[in-house]
Structure formats: C-alpha cells, structure tokens
C-alpha cells in the first residue's frame, strides 16, 4: 500500500514538473511572439514611413534636379561632417557646375545668410592639387579662390557665392547631397 | 546586430595589387553607407574609402586614382580594389557598415574585426 501511494506520489510530481516546464515554455513563447510583435511593428513602421514619404528627398532636404541637399546645423569638422553625411546615405556637396553652385548659394542665401559649409573638396598635401572626393576634379571655374596658408590639411568650403579653403580642422557648417530617388511612375 | 565579414588581405609587394571584400550580414532595416577605414598602431582610424547605397563615392587624398571602391547592393557586399600599392598603405583595414537598426531610425556604425594589409619587398 505504501509503495503504491509512493509511486503515485512520484507520478503527480513527474506531471507537476512537466506541467511547470510547459508553463515555462509558454511563457518564453510569450515572450518571443513578444519580441515578434515588436520586430514586426517597428519594420512595418520603418517601412510604412519609406513608403509613404515616395518624394524624392527625405524630409529637411532640399531638391535640385537629381540631387537631394541636407544643410547641416550643427558645426563639425570636415572628416567628421563626412561622416555624418555618410549616416545619411550621403556624401558631401560636389558642385558639377555654375547651375548647381547657383542653386546652392541662392538657397543658403534663403536659409541661414553668409555662413561657412564643408564641401566634399580637399588638397592633395603631395600635388596640391584640388579633388573632388570621388577622386575628379574640379572645373576651372569651381576651384577655391584663395589657397589657404595652412601647414595642415586644407579643404573646401562655399561662403555667399564663393568656393574658399581652409584648414580641415576648422569648426564650420556642411552640406550633404544625395541622389533623388527617381519616381517609378 | 550586424556582423561584417572581411577578406582579402595579405602580403604585397609595392605595386602590386588587392581586392579586400566585405559583407554584412545580420538584423537591420537598411545600410546606408559601406566603406573602408585603416587604422596603423597608436594612430585613429581614418577613412579610406566609402560608398552610399545610393552609389555615391568619397576617397581619402591619398588613395585617389589608385584604389578603387565599389558595392554590391543585394547582397549587402562593398569591394575595394587596391592597385599602385605603396608601402606607406600598410595597416589594418577595417571594413564598416553604417545601418539602420530594426529599432532605430538613425544609422550606427558597425566593424569588422579588421584585415592586416602588409606593402613590403
């Protein structure tokens, strides 16, 4: 009798732990649908918010033909405002002609007045030369004014209408330019 | 989390040339920039190369007209092709991914482990 009530005893307790493993499972079920759910909301709201701003800029951009224009806020030097264009999917402004530069320093005019941007223009320290940073050149008419005295590394900046250099550790605004996303209908 | 997966380094003579890949792998909701960075010992990280998913390139001076940085958009793949290498050009090279996390809605920066890239005769 009392190997009988023993066993069945040991029985309910083997059931009592299947069922507490059970519970845990759910729960950890739970929790992952969970996490799921938010996976799931935060893509359909990234997706959602892609979706629906189709324009051909992101929002506080500025549209010119096939660019996209991001005037920056905040002061940086120039690697570093490079790479706050990169986060953005972007590079710093290349000004391809006197259009695009006339557009450029009409809508700072607009926005902010006779400030400093980083352009995505640098020195060669070893030719001097003027470079663009996908490695072409400038045009004749889009070279900085006035060579910068600097020993260090000397970059390009648009101040009122006109292209100047300075040193590239110097704090100013910048401006990032990326390409318009072209409509599919 | 995305995780970065390097190759291509190795021993070079000057001259000579490399291909170094990297792809991204992992949860995010996009990549807006892949790019290059080289780091020698004591000194920061400085870029090399980077390319935009929207394709827009950026070189550091002194890679100019010599390494060359391209991008595979699906399969999340970014491609620097080193020609006319210098000895000066030797350090770790570190590929980077700048992502949108599923939960963010501004991109972070992402490292590979690095790959050592040596220029010597």
């Known amino acids: 009798k009392l190997l009988q009530v023993s066993t069945i005893a040991m029985q309910q307790q083997e059931k009592l732990i299947q069922q507490e493993r059970a519970l845990l499972n759910f729960t950890e079920w739970k929790r992952s649908c969970a996490l799921q759910m938010k996976y799931c909301q935060a893509f359909m709201q990234n997706s959602l918010s892609s979706a629906h701003n189709s324009s051909p800029c992101p929002n506080n951009w500025i549209q010119n033909r096939e660019s996209c224009y991001y005037v920056s806020e905040i002061w940086s030097i120039w690697h570093t405002s490079q790479e706050n264009c990169l986060k953005e999917g972007s590079t710093l402004l290349q000004i391809e002609s006197k259009e695009e530069m006339d557009f450029i320093t009409g809508s700072l005019r607009k926005i902010k007045g006779s400030y400093d941007y980083w352009v995505g223009l640098s020195q060669d320290g070893h030719s001097g030369r003027w470079l663009w940073q996908d490695g072409s050149s400038p045009s004749p008419g889009l070279l900085p004014a006035e060579r910068s005295q600097s020993a260090n590394q000397v970059c390009g900046y648009v101040k009122s209408n006109s292209l100047l250099s300075s040193n590239c550790s110097t704090w100013k605004y910048f401006i990032c330019e990326k390409y318009a996303l072209r409509s599919s209908v | 989390q995305v995780q970065l997966q390097e190759s291509g380094g190795g021993l070079v003579q000057p001259g000579g040339s490399l291909r170094l890949s990297c792809t991204a792998s992992g949860s995010f909701f996009s990549i807006n920039a892949m790019g290059w960075y080289r780091q020698a010992p004591g000194n920061q990280r400085e870029l090399v190369a980077a390319?935009?998913?929207?394709?827009?390139?950026a070189y550091t001076d002194s890679v100019k007209g010599r390494f060359t940085i391209s991008n595979d958009n699906a399969k999340n793949t970014v491609y620097l092709q080193m020609n006319s290498l210098k000895p000066e050009d030797t350090d770790v090279y570190y590929c980077n991914a700048k992502a949108i996390p599923i939960y963010g809605s501004t991109a972070e920066d992402y490292w590979g482990q690095g790959t050592q890239v040596t220029v010597s005769s």
């Open positions: 390319i935009t998913n929207g394709g827009r390139i």
